[in-house]
């Protein structure tokens, strides 16, 4: 019998009281086979975190800072369950950190030195460490003792709770600097009356705190936030705007053997009988023997964590950056106007070698970061593992959603101003073998399909939005009879026809032979019945173009297109045959590294673009026979994208509505993760 | 201005070695890495294997496990040991560092 046992740690007295009433109140509503709650006491938030990785204890709820310090080796302990504040309908299980100023005065983020700064307190999240952490290299050496260093970088300070004697500069704003509501300048409303009365410059505070304080819209329109890219933003596009997105207080577990599920089921169960307004008896999120025992008392409930969540996506590049910058106190030692190498991110063994190459050949300006999916990648961009890599519109959109941007654009026509003139998009296609005559778009039940992958444009968003227009559900393994869609999952029908081998089998990278545009067509050439495909594809892929075996001996004419309307043209005629026109794959990357890729990829594309007329002798960015890897060998430059700078506007109203239509059918672990983030 | 020259290349049984040595004349060799490619008769140059200056190395899947690539920054040297090999491995094979024309390269021809 399955242990169904949770044990909380608990880091106090109360606690441990409020634990033992909560195991006992569980007990008297959940059925013997359900969950259970069983107490562990421990000293500290840090005692705890050790007992859950040591497997003396199952789950805690932390602080955003403490979430930082159980995802640290060797603890590595992961979020599961978030408290959520405001309501059902519109529950906050995050803040935002903001950096407000006033609308008239001038400067950006990157000119704070010498200006007069207010903080909620020393050593607070949004009034300090966040902050802090994220100016920290910008702070004048030597940064230790921490205080001296922010004393030197402004011009003088509030922070409530330092030491007024050995850094005064601190105390100027508010003398004395003390650390409670006698303080005028103390905590989230303090910091904002010390930047409203014209004592500070700016102030470090959380999102709400504005919007507390001043209740009138034309009153908060005489304030703007600094954001990031050093541009300035209203009061109301926090989301947009902020130092960092930060969690309000999470359950955490372990990685491995952790019993999220348990957990979960728990803690869902526990909201239902004793949530907000439940019980009288017991009560979750209240403490009447101290404050926040176990859970806020300002909680109204749970939200299970997405499980492609780890810590580190959780709390966000922004707040992981700046915390660590406070820990760990090192800094790049290169001046921060030059560009880092841009590290870019390949998938599997075959991508890696081509980068490895552009790398050796980039004289250190291009660093290379593997991963077997581009999911994984866009993950290891949005934790700062990687920088860059160029992606089909499908990925443009789930990254976007996690926050990274498009900076480039692939081109696929020669003209004569490439790199200024981004084009409106490629075809995507549907085509079959011109001997399976009967076949139509209003015939495909029952037939074997080729995909690019799960979750690309041409071989996926764009026939699976038609066709669930058409069947109104998300069971396109059971419409088709087989297929090869990779990243479907293994048991699917939709692996059916795939070639990898082992583990490789519809993998959605180049080890699996029947991956992306190529190897669709491959599939339909050797097994399969549709393929959906580029509108180039096919003649990329016959008349000898492609040296390979399987495709050496290949004819254009012995295919054709379906077109929705129930006919069918040959290949050539796709500006009038095709399902809808795509976005072009584009360059993603965080907006803190935009900059510096599109600097580094423009020059980068001069050496070894398209203007390389000998591929064999020298190395040739956009070409990888027929694999597309990093880019489309088809590409012939990458284009500026002016200001189509956001996924929504790089992709276009239309496919982003495409693509949100079908998010119901979506698979994409990442992409739940990320709207977990941002709904 | 530097310059590389590839030897030890041969004729070989199949499922025997060879060792190939690329060495520069000049200074600067290697900084950013070396690579050695191959081009069989009537086919694409292909990348075989390359090492950085740290040391990293990669090499494409067909020779993994076979051939190792290695380095001698004071012998301004870099080495592909080829074992096991097949027929598929015959042809010139070429050292190549950025900013360095490829040199004439060695024959490599593997018998069945």
């Known amino acids: 019998v399955p242990d169904k046992t949770v044990r909380w740690c608990a880091v106090s007295e109360h606690e441990a009281t409020k634990c033992q009433s909560f195991r006992d109140h569980m007990k008297s509503v959940i059925p013997s086979d359900g969950p259970s709650v069983a107490c562990v006491k421990k000293a500290s938030y840090l005692d705890c975190i050790r007992a859950i990785a040591a497997n003396e204890a199952d789950a805690v709820t932390l602080d955003a800072g403490l979430v930082y310090d159980a995802y640290l080796a060797p603890n590595n302990l992961k979020p599961v369950v978030a408290e959520f504040y405001g309501s059902k309908e519109d529950p906050q299980t995050f803040y935002y950190a903001v950096a407000v100023v006033k609308k008239d005065s001038g400067f950006q983020m990157n000119q704070l030195r010498g200006k007069k700064s207010c903080h909620t307190g020393l050593g607070r999240s949004a009034g300090w460490n966040i902050p802090i952490g994220l100016l920290y290299c910008d702070l004048p050496e030597p940064r230790k003792p921490l205080e001296k260093a922010v004393a030197n970088f402004f011009s003088g300070s509030c922070a409530p709770c330092a030491d007024g004697t050995d850094f005064p500069q601190l105390c100027q704003l508010c003398p004395g600097c003390g650390c409670s509501t006698l303080n005028q300048y103390f905590g989230y409303s303090g910091a904002f009356k010390c930047l409203k009365d014209g004592a500070g410059d700016v102030a470090f505070v959380k999102h709400s705190t504005i919007f507390e304080n001043l209740a009138n819209k034309a009153d908060r329109d005489q304030y703007e936030l600094l954001c990031l890219d050093n541009t300035r933003k209203p009061v109301d596009e926090y989301k947009d705007c902020h130092l960092a997105q930060v969690p309000s207080h999470t359950v955490v577990a372990r990685s491995m053997g952790g019993k999220e599920d348990l957990i979960w089921e728990l803690l869902n169960q526990a909201q239902e009988h004793f949530g907000k307004d439940k019980s009288k008896e017991f009560q979750l999120f209240s403490s009447p023997h101290g404050k926040d025992l176990l859970f806020k008392d300002s909680a109204h409930g749970f939200l299970k964590v997405p499980p492609r969540m780890d810590a580190k996506m959780y709390l966000g590049y922004e707040y992981v950056t700046a915390i660590r910058n406070l820990r760990e106190g090192t800094c790049p030692e290169a001046p921060t106007d030059e560009c880092k190498p841009v590290k870019w991110c390949a998938l599997s063994h075959h991508e890696r070698l081509k980068c490895d190459e552009w790398s050796v050949n980039s004289v250190g300006k291009i660093e290379c970061v593997s991963a077997e999916t581009t999911e994984d990648c866009i993950a290891k961009i949005m934790n700062g593992e990687a920088d860059a890599m160029s992606l089909d519109g499908g990925f443009v959109y789930i990254a976007g959603k996690c926050g990274l941007v498009p900076v480039l654009a692939e081109n696929y026509n020669k003209s004569d101003n490439c790199e200024d003139t981004p084009e409106a998009g490629y075809f995507a296609i549907a085509v079959v073998k011109k001997s399976a005559s009967d076949l139509t778009w209003d015939n495909l039940k029952g037939k074997k399909s080729c995909h690019t992958a799960v979750g690309r444009t041409a071989g996926w968003n764009i026939p699976m939005g038609l066709l669930y227009n058409k069947i109104n559900h998300c069971r396109f393994d059971e419409f088709f009879s087989e297929g090869c869609a990779p990243g479907s999952k293994k048991d699917s029908s939709l692996c059916k026809l795939c070639m990898g081998s082992g583990l490789n089998l519809c993998e959605p990278n180049n080890k699996e032979g029947y991956y992306g545009y190529t190897g669709a067509f491959r599939c339909l050439v050797e097994k399969g019945d549709v393929a959906f495909v580029k509108h180039q594809t096919v003649p990329q892929n016959t008349g000898g173009k492609n040296p390979d075996p399987w495709a050496k001996n290949l004819n254009e004419k012995d295919y054709e297109l379906l077109c929705l309307d129930g006919t069918r043209k040959p290949v050539e005629e796709y500006a009038n045959c095709h399902l809808a026109r795509a976005p072009n794959h584009a360059v993603v990357t965080r907006k803190d590294k935009e900059a510096c890729v599109h600097k580094i990829l423009r020059q980068q594309q001069h050496l070894f673009g398209s203007n390389v007329t000998d591929c064999s002798g020298n190395f040739c960015l956009f070409r990888s026979e027929t694999k597309d890897l990093l880019f489309r060998d088809d590409t012939v430059c990458l284009a500026k994208l002016h200001d189509r700078n956001t996924y929504e506007k790089y992709l276009g109203e239309e496919y982003v509505k495409a693509v949100g239509n079908l998010r119901k059918c979506s698979t994409s672990s990442l992409l739940e993760a990320c709207t977990f983030r941002r709904p | 201005q530097v310059k590389l020259e590839e030897s030890g290349g041969g004729l070989v049984q199949a499922g025997g070695s060879l060792r190939l040595s690329c060495v520069a004349s000049?200074?600067?060799?290697?900084?950013?890495?070396v690579i050695w490619y191959r081009q069989a008769p009537g086919k694409q140059r292909e990348l075989v294997a390359l090492?950085?200056?740290?040391?990293?190395?990669n090499y494409r899947e067909s020779v993994r496990g076979r051939f190792t690539i290695s380095r001698d920054d004071a012998k301004n040297t870099v080495w592909l040991q080829m074992n096991a090999l097949e027929p598929e491995d015959t042809g010139v094979y070429y050292c190549?560092?950025?900013?360095?024309?490829f040199g004439q390269g060695t024959q490599v021809t593997v018998s069945s």
């Open positions: 190549k560092t950025p900013g360095v024309p």
């Open positions: 000049g200074s600067g060799f290697g900084i950013n890495g």
């Open positions: 090492i950085k200056s740290d040391g990293y190395t």
